[in-house]
């Protein structure tokens, strides 16, 4: 009786069961009641990630530099190749196919999460007592100067773009 | 590339045994179907039998069932022919042959053969 | 079983001329992947047999391409388009639809 369903790493054709090809192999012919599958290894600039029964290795990813890519991660016979972002750039998507420079925090806001390869700024406003001037991708929120530490007082109040200005104590005599 | 070499031919009385070897080399011996198939003097081709890459599958010629066994040993690179309670009939060049596959069913690939005389 | 026979049992050839066997089975030896299941031997002269044609027209690597296989079902024909000296010996058909495989009685083909 002809199976109807084949066991886990084979296929059903010509009503027999063939075993798939490992991955990091592609198809080259169907295995016959007296001949097994028959698979060849992938090119060095291909691969394929699954038993399977493919006839045609997937092209290794190119991480193009003009895409702001570079390898991550060289790709073999069973895996593609991992791409990432050039230092300052993140991916655009899940699938990093392009880079976008990291964004900078503005005046009143601070890093709270420095820009991955993967992933972009995450920035977070100043709370009350810091602050953050410049616009900047790697800048925290600083806290205000302390006034009293230095023997000074509050001359003007900080905001989340400023720091406090501190000035000489009146002297009362 | 694909070599065949049989051997364990000879002479023989009525009644006795033989095993044939063939020795396989040039192609993965594992992942093919082989055949022996037979030439009595001066007459047409024979096929004998069959026996699948993993040895799950195996076929005899009903001339020969029963009375012949085809067997292999992968990890030897070796086909076999256990040829049990010989006849005159049987006398022949035999010939083992590698199956071809799904692209060519049937023997693609054959030895130089060995001779093998059943008289008494 | 499925019993094969060939025509002429002999032929002789002159070199460059065509020349065509004929094979026949008492089965169909078309399967349902669309393939004829036969194959053509030749067996030269004190050497074994070699194949040249698979699937009824596939030609073997090495094969000249004066050879040519056609037909389906049940009637084959091999063919050589300029029959050289190199060609002498027998040919076979052989049916490899279903065990137990069988060959025709074979064309013994000479060189006038």
């Known amino acids: 009786e002809p199976p109807t369903a084949c066991r886990e790493k084979q296929y059903l054709i010509n009503s027999q069961c063939c075993s798939l090809c490992q991955p990091g192999q592609k198809l080259v012919s169907d295995c016959t009641e007296f001949t097994e599958t028959e698979c060849l290894p992938c090119s060095e600039s291909e691969f394929l990630d699954t038993w399977n029964r493919e006839t045609r290795c997937h092209q290794h990813k190119y991480c193009d530099p003009n895409l702001g890519l570079r390898v991550q991660q060289k790709g073999t016979s069973e895996t593609d190749t991992i791409c990432t972002c050039e230092e300052g750039l993140h991916c655009m998507s899940e699938s990093c196919e392009s880079c976008v420079p990291h964004r900078s925090c503005l005046p009143g806001f601070g890093v709270k999460q420095i820009a991955t390869g993967v992933s972009d700024t995450i920035c977070e406003p100043c709370p009350v007592g810091f602050f953050s001037n410049v616009s900047s991708a790697f800048e925290k929120c600083r806290p205000w100067t302390s006034c009293e530490t230095k023997d000074l007082v509050v001359q003007q109040a900080g905001t989340n773009k400023t720091d406090v200005v501190c000035g000489p104590q009146d002297r009362q005599r | 590339q694909v070599q065949l070499v049989e051997s364990g031919g000879g002479v023989v009385q009525p009644g006795r045994s033989l095993r044939l070897s063939c020795a396989a080399s040039?192609?993965?011996?594992?992942?093919?179907?082989m055949h022996w198939v037979r030439q009595a003097p001066g007459k047409g081709l024979e096929w004998v039998a069959v026996?699948?890459?993993?040895?799950?599958?195996?076929y005899h010629a009903d001339s020969v069932k029963g009375r012949f066994t085809i067997s292999r040993d992968n990890s030897k690179i070796t086909l076999y022919l256990q040829m049990n309670s010989l006849r005159t009939e049987d006398t022949a060049v035999y010939y083992c042959a590698r199956d071809g596959g799904i692209a060519a069913p049937g023997p693609d690939y054959w030895g130089q053969g060995t001779l093998v005389t059943v008289s008494s | 079983d499925i019993v094969m026979t060939q025509s002429p049992l002999s032929l002789t050839v002159t070199p460059g001329e065509p020349a065509s066997i004929s094979c026949r089975s008492s089965?169909?030896?078309?399967?349902?992947?669309?393939?004829?299941?036969l194959d053509w031997y030749l067996q030269k002269p004190g050497q074994s047999p070699q194949v040249l044609i698979s699937l009824g027209s596939n030609r073997a690597s090495g094969v000249p391409d004066r050879f040519s296989g056609s037909g389906s079902g049940t009637d084959f024909t091999l063919k050589i388009s300029r029959v050289e000296a190199e060609d002498v010996g027998v040919y076979y058909c052989m049916q490899a639809r279903q065990t137990p495989f069988t060959f025709g009685p074979g064309t013994k083909v000479d060189i006038r």
């Open positions: 040039g192609f993965t011996f594992s992942s093919y179907g």
């Open positions: 026996i699948s890459y993993e040895e799950s599958n195996r």
């Open positions: 089965q169909s030896l078309l399967y349902s992947n669309g393939y004829n299941y």
